[in-house]
């Protein structure tokens, strides 16, 4: 049905399927050193890995996409691993008069799914 | 900044970058013929195409991902083309006693972005 349960066990082997992974990045990596003061390094959680058939399907559309990819792989791409939710991050950034704190809601992934 | 503008012109040539495309699918294709009565065919809008640097970035996370992919392509995947919004779809589906109408909100893509 349109509400088939997404698969949660990875058929490709450990660490191969869509999951959250931490990537360390400096302000220089991000091109932010001119406007962000702190933190100097960020532990960025990102979504990586493959999306085999029905693995962590985001919704009905992703289930359809997975099925049609199986039937028409040249025409329909497989679902891909993207954030399902985010962790807010506070950055201390430079202003004309000094520094201020600002919270960014869409910077670091908290969970992943296949969309 | 964290709010750099996403690019909207495709540097790869027409039709190569993330966009909405229509795929025709039958109930049999979807594996739904046992529980859906109508429509017998669906015009499914899906998100296809590549996500070159900063093209249609979904949010700050996608911009970071694009940048880090440029620096560490083996470790950080490029953003990928996924739905940004959906068109609801009404299906006439079989019940024990006959048919009923049900609307699905997450079945057909209406817009795409790179996440």
């Amino acid at each position: 049905s349109a509400h088939a349960h997404p698969r949660d066990s990875c058929p490709l082997g450990p660490g191969r399927c869509c999951h959250l992974e931490t990537v360390q990045a400096t302000l220089e990596d991000l091109g932010w050193s001119d406007w962000v003061l702190s933190p100097r390094q960020l532990q960025l959680s990102m979504c990586v890995g493959e999306c085999p058939h029905l693995y962590r399907s985001a919704n009905t559309h992703a289930q359809i996409k997975a099925r049609l990819h199986g039937l028409q792989p040249d025409k329909v791409p497989a679902p891909c691993c993207v954030p399902s939710s985010y962790t807010p991050v506070v950055l201390m950034h430079r202003t004309d008069s000094g520094v201020s704190l600002q919270t960014y809601d869409d910077l670091v992934a908290r969970g992943c799914h296949c969309a | 900044s964290a709010h750099a503008h996403p690019r909207d012109s495709c540097p790869l040539g027409p039709g190569r970058c993330c966009h909405l495309e229509t795929v025709q699918a039958t109930l049999e294709d979807l594996g739904w013929s046992d529980w859906v009565l109508s429509p017998r065919q669906l015009q499914l809008s899906m998100c296809v195409g590549e996500c070159p640097h900063l093209y249609r970035s979904a949010n700050t996370h996608a911009q970071i991902k694009a940048r880090l992919h440029g620096l560490q392509p083996d470790k950080v995947p490029a953003p990928c083309c996924v739905p940004s919004s959906y068109t609801p779809v009404v299906l006439m589906h079989r019940t024990d006693s006959g048919v009923s109408l049900q609307t699905y909100d997450d079945l057909v893509a209406r817009g795409c972005h790179c996440a």
Partner: antibody, heavy 118, light 107 residues
Framework: QVTLKESGPGILQPSQTLSLTCSFS??????????VGWIRQPSGKGLEWLAN???????YYNSALKSRLTISKDTSNNQVFLKISSVDTADTATYYC??????????WGQGTLVTVSS | DIVMTQSQKFMSTSVGDRVSVTCKAS??????VAWYQQKPGQSPKALIY???YRYSGVPDRFTGSGSGTDFTLTISNVQSEDLAEYFC?????????FGGGTKLEIK
């Protein structure tokens, strides 16, 4: 809960243009597969389909009346409109709008009586 | 245009009886036929979709059958509230067309 309600002028004279409005709730005309149709019924007679409009703005008309009919929609306000030009006494009927899904009419309005009289 | 013919304009039955209302299409319409009930002074109400599928909330004494050109709506164990006119409709092709209706009278 799906509801539809028709409104019209009640009485009009021959050769005038009849303007009908269908206001609905409980569904959206931006939903794939959804449509609204107009059907009329002269007193004591059968049902005659007039026109319909779909979520994607496709429009279909009764071939016998096509030159006189215009259907349109205002999706954001949940309204569908039907205009019938050059009315005659034969257009006297109860006019219904109905939610149309894949060809059939799942829910109907209560109807509005239109009388064409000189 | 496809003509839908309901040859019986009136049918008389008693409470508890079984009655069959028929409808004939002028050409093959597959199973793309619906049935509606219209009680006196009311708007039509959907009963059957795709020739044989009862719409949600419709009592199971209403049954649709047929395909191609011949269709039947059967009401078993007729109740007094079934006093109404019954219409068939084809949606196989435009223009959509209705049958002329069959009025069910309760003795």
């Amino acid at each position: 809960q799906v509801t539809l309600k028709e409104s019209g002028p009640g009485i009009l004279q021959p050769s005038q243009t009849l303007s009908l409005t269908c206001s609905f709730s409980g569904f959206s005309l931006s939903t794939y597969g959804m449509g609204v149709g107009w059907i009329r019924q002269p007193s004591g007679k059968g049902l005659e389909w007039l026109a319909n409009i779909w979520w994607n703005d496709d429009k279909y008309y009764n071939s016998a009346l096509k030159s006189r009919l215009t259907i349109s929609k205002d999706t954001s306000n949940n309204q569908v409109f039907l205009k019938i030009s050059s009315v005659d006494t034969a257009d006297t009927a109860t006019y219904y709008c109905a939610q149309e899904v894949y060809g059939w009419f799942a829910y109907w309005g209560q109807g509005t009586l239109v009388t064409v009289s000189s | 245009d496809i003509v839908m013919t309901q040859s019986q304009k009136f049918m008389s039955t008693s409470v508890g009886d079984r009655v069959s209302v028929t409808c004939k299409a002028s050409q093959n319409v597959g199973t793309n036929v619906a049935w509606y009930q219209q009680k006196p002074g009311q708007s039509p109400k959907a009963l059957i979709y795709s020739a044989s599928y009862r719409y949600s909330g419709v009592p199971d004494r209403f049954t649709g059958s047929g395909s191609g050109t011949d269709f039947t709506l059967t009401i078993s164990n007729v109740q007094s509230e079934d006093l109404a006119e019954y219409f068939c409709q084809q949606y196989n092709s435009y223009p959509l067309t209705f049958g002329g209706g069959t009025k069910l009278e309760i003795k």
